[in-house]
Amino acid sequence: HNTTVFQGVAGQSLQVSCPYDSMKHWGRRKAWCRQLGEKGPCQRVVSTHNLWLLSFLRRWNGSTAITDDTLGGTLTITLRNLQPHDAGLYQCQSLHGSEADTLRKVLVEVLADPLDHRDAGDLWFPGESESFEDAHVEH
């Protein structure tokens, strides 16, 4: 998996989207987890509703929300009131039994200021951005 970089500004909200094949992952719940080290496990942050048919309902854990458009095939994670310690490597996962498939690897970056963005123009909005090297950056 390539890594997609999402950049947000401290104190603001950041929305992360994870597209997937809706047919392949039909009936599967989804989760958002944080990779705590090179070899460590992916620590679950939040998962979609226990009833797959209700996956569209937003579920919160602290300042992190998850909602799943199961027909369109888009998992959306919202990080509210973004803080520096929210930065890190995450995964969108599709769950089946005790197994989990990685839908997307996501690197969340929290900037002190919108103008800290590497390629900042006159205006910069948080989210998804340009590709470079093996990463895909979103803003």
Epitope: Q7, Q35, A87, L107, E109, D116, H117
Partner: antibody, heavy 121, light 107 residues
């Protein structure tokens, strides 16, 4: 073993610029944030800013914006900080400090030995 | 910016004595605090992170705790190598800020 080797002491003239380095070893350089910290003689520590070596994204303490520029060279696993328009106020020891995995969510576990910068005519 | 008020600024104590240093945060930092030790040669070492988690290799006589916005570092029984400068660091929000430091000296 994680090591951060900083460049040696420098004596520079007011108005000049200086670029110091922090060579990392013992870990995957691009996986960990790198912070820079200032300590003026006999004073406390001040956070200057942080760089994500993987993307090059930076965040600065507003106080040091325009004064410090953080960069990395991934091929040599080296982080750099350039200070410009130097004055006597910039005379200090500067430390690089490694963060945690793609973040600073556990603070700064590893520190360099510091680079002494003296600004004098 | 979050102010970290560290006390005392200096402390004289004897070998074997129990000492506590405190940092008070001006805003909520939710336990995102670490304690650092700086030796006279300038070497800096992290002792504690997440307010109370001891770094590997750090002697168990060091401990960290939290009470509301007050964070403490306690050394249960001072040893000669503990005489140094100590700083707290909050990494909850930008800009990260340090306490003013405590100089721990031998009485």
């Amino acid at each position: 073993e994680v090591q951060l080797q900083e460049s040696g002491p420098v004596l520079v003239k007011p108005g000049a610029s200086v670029k110091m380095s922090c060579k990392a070893s013992g870990y995957t350089f691009t996986d960990y944030y790198m912070n820079w910290v200032k300590q003026s003689h006999g004073k406390s520590l001040e956070w200057i800013g942080v760089i994500n070596p993987y993307t090059g994204a930076t965040s600065y303490n507003q106080k040091f914006k325009g004064k410090a520029t953080l960069t990395v060279d991934k091929s040599s696993s080296t982080a750099y900080m350039e200070l410009n328009s130097l004055t006597s106020e910039d005379s200090a020891v500067y430390y690089c400090a490694r963060g945690t995995y793609y973040s600073n969510y556990e603070g700064f576990p590893y520190w360099g030995q510091g680079t002494l910068v003296t600004v004098s005519a | 910016d979050i102010q970290m008020t560290q006390s005392p600024s200096s402390l004289s104590a004897s070998l074997g004595e129990r000492v506590s240093l405190t940092c008070r945060a001006s805003q909520e930092i939710s336990g995102y605090l670490s304690w650092l030790q700086q030796k006279p040669d300038g070497t800096i070492k992290r002792l504690i992170y997440a307010a109370s988690t001891l770094d590997s290799g750090v002697p168990k006589r060091f401990s960290g705790s939290r009470s509301g916005s007050d964070y403490s570092l306690t050394i249960s029984s001072l040893e000669s190598e503990d005489f140094a400068d100590y700083y707290c660091l909050q990494y909850a929000s930008y800009p990260y800020t340090f306490g003013g430091g405590t100089k721990l000296e031998i009485k």
